[in-house]
């Protein structure tokens, strides 16, 4: 996104910043994006390599076991409950993820590799 | 909204300890940071450190680290900050607060701890 | 450790008018500032968090502005329950910090 040029007299009340995302590696100097109705700025940030190193994802969530598989979809799905997130990160209580259905032996193998992500 | 309830200020005597509870209540306590803020009488707002319930990562000011030990038990909903080797000046109100960076925090009501002979 | 400055010490004012309270970092804290309200015997209320993103159930006529070293709390009109100490604090990194404060008063 690039930087609009504010209009002259026009005041934006409240920016809503995304994450800092480093321009090499995990961490270290990188750019965060905000935007405020139609303006949006990029600003310089940095993401501290020992906070990286200690909390890994931004947000960790529980998940409950797969739904059954829908039909009218071809996909199930499952919901997580917000188990951790790094101090600064704006994480959603809840997330419901979704994925094809697919035989019982890829699901169970697709499946158990989801649930150490939690 | 989570609400947060103090106990176990008072009066202790220098080179005494204290165990501090923050009880929650509410929404899930959990999933949040829990802080520890002090403040002496008359005097601004100092972060003693911080302790996460679900697997009890701990960041302490370093001010502290010989001082302070953060706790949680999940079961009861309940934080601890146990203060040790306490002096005059740790005279203050101390006071939880449950943080999340989307929806803000929730403090305690805070608790007076008063050191003296 | 991050050194926050706040200024000015004490701000007196009158019912309705603007005020405008400052937070400077001895470096930058991108938008990790938030800004609390107190008042005596009470514990901190959280006016403001990431350096302009609103609370629910705080009044619209506080507003903050950032990101960098240096930081703004406006009261667009100051009303009577206004009157308390306001901190800034950053969560940049460890350890966390406070501004020093600056008490808003009736003129």
């Known amino acids: 996104k690039k930087k609009e040029k504010v209009k002259k007299g026009s005041e934006c009340s409240e920016w809503t910043w995304g994450p800092c995302t480093p321009s090499s590696k995990d961490c270290g100097m990188g750019f965060r994006e905000g935007t405020c109705g139609a303006q949006t700025q990029r600003v310089h940030c940095k993401v501290p390599c020992n906070w990286k190193k200690e909390f890994g994802a931004d947000c960790k969530y529980k998940f409950e076991s797969w739904g059954a598989c829908d039909g009218s979809t071809g996909t199930k799905a499952r919901q997580g409950t917000l188990k951790k997130a790094r101090y600064n990160a704006q994480c959603q209580e809840t997330i419901r993820v979704t994925k094809p259905c697919t035989s019982k032996t890829k699901s169970k193998t697709k499946a158990k590799k989801g649930k150490g992500k939690d | 909204q989570v609400q947060l309830v103090q106990s176990g200020g008072g009066l202790v005597q220098p080179g005494g300890s204290l165990r501090l509870s923050c009880a929650a209540s509410?929404?899930?306590?959990?999933?949040?940071?829990m802080n520890w803020v002090r403040q002496a009488p008359g005097q601004g707002l100092e972060w003693i450190g911080m302790?996460?319930?679900?697997?009890?990562?701990?960041i302490l000011n370093q001010k502290f680290k010989d001082k302070a030990t953060l706790t949680v038990d999940i079961s009861k909903n309940t934080a601890y900050l146990q203060m040790n080797s306490l002096r005059a000046e740790d005279t203050a109100v101390y006071y939880c607060?449950?943080?999340?960076?989307?929806?803000?925090?929730?403090w305690g009501q805070g608790t007076l701890v008063t050191v003296s002979s | 450790e991050i050194v926050l400055t706040q200024s000015p010490a004490t701000l007196s004012l009158s019912p309705g008018e603007r005020a405008t309270l400052s937070c400077r970092a001895s470096?930058?804290?991108?938008?990790?500032l938030h800004w609390y309200q107190q008042k005596p015997g009470q514990a901190p209320r959280l006016l403001i968090k990431?350096?302009?993103q609103s609370i629910s159930g705080i009044p619209a006529r506080f507003s903050g502005s950032g990101p960098g070293t240096d930081f703004t709390l406006t009261i667009s009109s100051v009303e009577p329950e206004d009157f308390a100490v306001y901190y800034c604090?950053?969560?940049?990194?460890?350890?966390?910090?406070f501004g020093g404060g600056t008490k808003l008063e009736i003129k």
């Open positions: 604090q950053q969560s940049n990194s460890w350890p966390l910090t």
């Open positions: 302790i996460h319930p679900s697997d009890s990562e701990t």
């Open positions: 607060s449950s943080w999340s960076a989307k929806r803000g925090d929730f």
């Open positions: 990431y350096a302009s």
């Open positions: 509410g929404q899930s306590f959990s999933s949040y940071w």
């Open positions: 470096e930058s804290i991108s938008n990790n």
